[in-house]
């Protein structure tokens, strides 16, 4: 039987409360051997895939998704999943991105990702590896910044 894949984690740098117009980077982490990380938003069909996966530690890989200039439209819950042939992982917990006016008060503390969001059904998939659908070279800002689409 195939080994279960550990759930990914998600975090945000420099934090989850971001001033309007500033940048944020989502960091997805999983085990070594991940081929594709995917960043998703709740209740949406749009996503951003990357195969630019680096080794964060001897037992962990990561991918980074940067939004250069956040708008109100970027606020909301984000999560990661990953593909380690031949299986997809479960989804990470949701991480809520808050966008604040630049004239606002002091920064809120960073939100750390939770450890578990409960079990998710796993695929019974023994398929061969396939190339992921083409990402068309789009940046996360284009995918998630649609209120000020370039």
């Amino acid at each position: 039987q195939e080994e279960d894949l550990p759930r990914p984690s998600i975090s945000a740098e420099p934090g989850t409360v971001i001033p309007l117009g500033s940048h944020v980077t989502f960091v997805c982490r999983g085990p070594v051997g991940v081929q594709t990380f995917r960043l998703e938003r709740e209740s949406r069909s749009t996503y951003n895939d990357t195969e630019d996966v680096s080794q964060a530690s001897p037992s962990e890989s990561e991918a980074r998704f940067r939004i250069d200039s956040v708008s109100e439209g970027n606020a909301g819950p984000y999560r990661c999943i990953y593909y380690k042939p031949p299986k997809w992982s479960e989804q990470s917990d949701y991480l809520e991105l808050l966008v604040k006016e630049t004239s606002g008060g002091p920064d809120s503390p960073d939100t750390e990702p939770g450890s578990s969001a409960g079990p998710t059904q796993r695929p019974s998939d023994n398929s061969h590896n396939e190339h992921a659908p083409a990402s068309q070279g789009l940046k996360a800002e284009h995918l998630y910044h649609h209120h000020h689409h370039h």
Epitope: R38, E42, S43, R44, S45, T46, Y47, N48, D49, G73, I81, Y83, P86, K87, W88, S89, E90, Q91, T120, Q121, R122, P123, D125, S127, H128, E130, A132, P133, A134, S135, Q136, L138, L143, H146, H147, H149
Partner: antibody, heavy 117, light 110 residues
Framework: EQSLESGGGLITPGGTLTLTCTAS????????MNWVRQAPGKGLEWIGY?????KTYYANWAKGRFTISKTSTTVDLKMTSLTAEDTGTYFC??????????????WGPGTLVTISS | ELVLTQTPASVSEPVGGTVTIKCQAS??????LAWYQQKPGQPPKLLIY???RLASGVSSRFGGSGSGTEFTLTISDLECADAATYYC????????????FGGGTEVVVK
């Protein structure tokens, strides 16, 4: 690459029917696999999709009565409490091009479901 | 909930002419809109995605534009083979939707 729906036919009101979409040339777990239906002479109606770790989304009207599941090569649509309004052609369509699971670039020919007593 | 309104319901133009179909979203969807062509007895065919990107193998006579809530499909230099029903589809939201497709526009080529 292609997909083919099967399992359609004539069924009585109140019954349950499961349609199957069989993929060839690609692996369904790497894509968003959608079900779309079309009543005779009417427009397209999205039912829902499944992807990744069997994550599903459904149209509001389909929740509870329709269930999508999958294996590595097939995607099933289970329909319960069928009525005459469920009569139509049911399509299986692959999504994922252009970074959206709702961009449907590969469609099966469809299978006809008729609900009648 | 997000609703797509397609106009007109039907349009008739001569060979060589131009057809413009509009799709209005009840809330902003950025550029997450696709267009499909469907001929009788056939499944739909993806023409355009992300509002203006041409799908593989689709003629450049088809063009898409718009963002936010207003979108347009333009078919230029009409051919008899373009006679079909055209549907827009929002490609962003999968939660709290009744349908992702617009109502369709029948194109008749005279």
């Amino acid at each position: 690459e292609q997909s083919l729906e099967s399992g359609g036919g004539l069924i009585t009101p109140g019954g349950t029917l499961t349609l199957t979409c069989t993929a060839s040339g690609f692996t369904v777990t790497r894509y968003y696999m959608n079900w779309v239906r079309q009543a005779p002479g009417k427009g397209l109606e999205w039912i829902g999709y499944i992807y990744a770790s069997s994550k599903t989304y459904y149209a509001n009207w389909a929740k509870g009565r329709f269930t999508i599941s999958k294996t590595s090569t097939t995607v099933d649509l289970k329909m319960t409490s069928l009525t005459a309004e469920d009569t139509g052609t049911y399509f299986c369509a692959r999504g994922g091009v252009g970074n959206s699971g709702l961009n449907l670039d590969l469609w099966g020919p469809g299978t006809l479901v008729t609900i009648s007593s | 909930e997000l609703v797509l309104t397609q106009t007109p319901a039907s349009v008739s133009e001569p060979v060589g002419g131009t057809v413009t179909i509009k799709c209005q979203a009840s809330q902003s969807i950025g550029s997450w809109l696709a267009w499909y062509q469907q001929k009788p007895g056939q499944p739909p065919k993806l023409l355009i995605y992300q509002a203006s990107r041409l799908a593989s193998g689709v003629s450049s006579r088809f063009g898409g534009s718009g963002s936010g809530t207003e979108f347009t499909l333009t078919i230029s230099d009409l051919e008899c083979a373009d006679a079909a029903t055209y549907y827009c589809q929002q490609a962003e939201y999968s939660g709290d939707v009744e349908n992702t497709f617009g109502g369709g526009t029948e194109v008749v080529v005279k």
